[in-house]
């Protein structure tokens, strides 16, 4: 006899990285027929929703209108069908950004490199933080964590064309409170070692696209946005 129901999926819309004072919705997707959903924050009950009619709804949304550092942390959800409860969802790490200051991201030897060249990113922030995060734009984006008093180095090693993309960095005041994002730096990698020049390009990153990428887990799993429930656990644990 089954003692628990399958765990629900949990994710944040539009993104798990939320600028302070902006809104975010935490979504929990269980099964049709669930009569109650509970959202837990840092291990304690945070909110409850009872969908009506339960047989036609398999997802609930918990709305946070004004993100701040007190709301940042780890969320999970469970649901109930009759008297039977589900396993808890994976943890959702909700991060508040745009806290305090803006770091500077730089790249050596430059934004245009040849495949095989050693590339290092540097994230610098003069205020009180010692953890830095380097993020690459994209649906299967890579995240690196680095440490330093005012600057962290992120050596990518000899690069390939797979390293092409737009990078930003953050200073982290704790696991769930991050600085403003740095200006973007676009890395262009040419695969032909003979072709050692590229037309100059001014890296741009439209502000409205910053929230559109997702982060892969350690397994590199990629899911549809609606089913995403792993939100950079490799980064935050």
């Amino acid at each position: 006899q089954q003692q628990t129901l399958p765990k629900p999926f949990i994710w944040a819309e539009p993104h798990f990285m939320v600028p302070k004072e902006k809104q975010v919705t935490i979504c929990c997707q269980g099964n049709y027929g669930a009569v109650e959903y509970q959202l837990h924050f840092e291990g304690s009950l945070f909110a409850v929703d009872r969908p009506k009619p339960p047989e036609r709804i398999n997802k609930v949304q918990f709305y946070i209108p004004d993100m701040n550092s007190r709301m940042a942390g780890q969320y999970s959800c469970i649901y109930r069908v009759g008297e039977l409860w589900s396993e808890p969802s994976n943890l959702l790490d909700l991060v508040v950004t745009e806290m305090y200051d803006t770091p500077t991201l730089s790249v050596h030897p430059g934004p245009e490199v040849i495949s095989g060249e050693k590339v290092t990113f540097y994230c610098r922030l003069d205020t009180a933080t010692s953890m830095f995060l380097l993020l690459k734009e994209g649906r299967s984006s890579h995240v690196q964590r680095g440490y330093g008093k005012v600057q962290a180095e992120f050596p990518l090693g000899p690069v390939t064309t797979a390293h092409r993309g737009t990078y930003r960095c953050f200073g982290s005041y704790n696991n769930h409170a991050w600085s403003f994002p740095s200006e973007p730096v676009k890395l262009l990698v040419t695969g032909d070692i003979e072709n050692t020049s590229l037309a100059p390009e001014d890296p741009t990153f439209p502000a409205d696209t910053w929230g559109t990428y997702l982060l892969t887990t350690e397994t590199g799993l990629q899911k549809d946005h609606a089913l995403w429930d792993h939100t950079a656990q490799n980064l935050l644990r």
Epitope: L105, V107, H108, P109, I114, E183, P184, P200, D202, P203
Partner: nanobody, 121 residues
Amino acid sequence: DVQLVESGGGLVQAGGSLRLSCAASGRTFNTIHWFRQAPGKEREFVARIWWIERTTFYAASVKGRFTISRDNAKNMVYLQMNSLKPEDTAVYYCAADARYTGSRRWESDYWGQGTQVTVSS
């Protein structure tokens, strides 16, 4: 004390050649970059060379005309400039381990004082 000193600039007619030198002293570097800055314009990347690997990279505007090289024994980096054009007129700077910071801005802890190159038509 770390020092980068450029030399070799001057006045040359269009189509002519010049060789710029950058003397690096005080420590070892991973890369040496050449930049240039024309009056009223932003500093622009020209070429770079890795000190050990000798890998080179050029801006599209100078590829095929300029050649960067280095002499380990003398701690010198050279920029051989051929088929010069009036639009190559600028102050040329060398920099060590320069880093790009976005929006066409570059930073380095070590810059030379610059050498003027003027190409007349």
